[in-house]
């Protein structure tokens, strides 16, 4: 497994590790913020979770998300998108039994309670970008990324590599 530090060792009791028949290679507990340092927060409303993008007050505590990393072999002849070789995928869970999901029909990002194994909609290809940022590309829809739209998370179609680094699909991960 990847080398993991103390804060990342949280989780084992919280999350059963067998997802889609494979175990995560490591897990990482982090707060998620936008390129412009707005925080991604999660609120329980009417028995379902809502996701917000907002500026936090000075001493307000950031919400944490558990990132579970998976190794993925991606042969181009199967995917048809010209991408091959090894890559890293993640699932994102802000609280027990809830995971971020890509709703490709609605172009939305939602929190769903689900059983294991997790559906493909809960998996995202993790991109290591410039400026200490990452991006999350939908496993189920190559070229579609989690992004920020109107103070919410949404799915944003990136038509070509020309738009891959627009700031609204860049996120920062932080242990604090």
């Amino acid at each position: 497994a990847f080398g993991i530090s103390g804060v990342q060792k949280y989780t084992r009791a919280l999350h059963d590790s067998s997802i889609t028949g494979i175990s995560p290679i490591t897990e990482y507990l982090a707060s998620l913020s936008t390129y412009n340092d707005q925080s991604i927060t999660f609120a329980l409303e009417d028995e379902s979770y809502e996701i917000y993008v907002e500026d936090l007050k000075k001493d307000e505590k950031k919400d944490k998300v558990l990132l579970s990393y998976y190794e993925s072999q991606h042969p181009s002849n199967e995917s048809g998108d010209g991408v091959d070789g090894k890559m890293l995928m993640v699932t994102l869970s802000p609280t027990k039994d809830f995971w971020l999901h890509a709703n490709n029909k609605e172009h939305s990002v939602e929190l769903h309670k689900c059983e294991k194994p997790l559906p493909d909609q809960a998996f995202f290809v993790l991109h290591n970008m410039h400026s200490n940022c990452v991006s999350f590309e939908c496993k189920t829809d190559p070229g579609v990324f989690i992004g920020v739209k109107d103070n919410h998370l949404a799915l944003i179609k990136v038509d070509s590599s020309e738009n891959l680094c627009t700031e609204n699909i860049l996120f920062k991960l932080s242990e604090t």
């Epitope: 497994a1 990847f2 080398g3 993991i4 530090s5 990342q8 290679i25 490591t26 897990e27 990482y28 982090a30 990132l67 990393y69 991606h74 181009s76 998108d81 010209g82 991408v83 091959d84 070789g85 090894k86 890559m87 890293l88 290809v125 993790l126 991109h127 290591n128 970008m129 410039h130 200490n132 990452v134 070509s160 590599s161 020309e162 738009n163 891959l164 680094c165 627009t166 991960l173």
Partner: antibody
Amino acid sequence: EVKLEESGGGLVQPGGSMKLSCVASGFTFNKFWMNWVRQSPEKGLEWVAEIRLNSINYVKDYAESVKGRFTISRDDSKNSVYLQMNNLRAEDTGIYYCIRRNYGNWFFEIWGAGTTVTVSS
Amino acid sequence: DIVLTQSPASLAVSLGQRATISCRASESVDRYGISFMNWFQQKPGQSPKLLIYAASNQGSGVPARFSGSGSGTDFSLNIHPLEEDDAAMYFCQHSKEVPYTFGGGTKLEIK
């Protein structure tokens, strides 16, 4: 088959110039960050330069030892990456490898066979 | 710059035994809970080949005999059981940030 093929190496005098080319095949070139790394008996393996994607205006990074002398570029329509080397020095001698990072940009995944550059009078 | 110090510079190990190569970084190569440490094998006249990425994950087509471990600043590559074909140079490399740097290499001989 994923393949990277370098060309353009050879013998050049100190102070001279040379342009290396690398042609990629077997994958969608414009989705990948590309790098040049060189190897010599004296310095071992040494990263030279990296070029990212059109999205970030082809952000480029260079090793301190080549800054201002070397320029990395790419032509996605030709599936090619280049290394223009000016004001060459004896210490630039080595095998130059073209490298593709993995999808997602975490590590060096595919290496070309290399092309040899010799700087000598 | 992150300096990678590999040890030993060379070693000779008997067929079927275990070879262990170490790599120490001058500062942590961890970020996002991932160790940006990779291992490459290079045979004479060939380009380096990816063996292990992110400290402990095998590259495509790499036999299970090759394993990596470590985090932060201390990493190791293990080969067991050793085969004749494993005689080569081995390099560690970090990909955390530019400039990406390599270790000086370890020459592995089979006794």
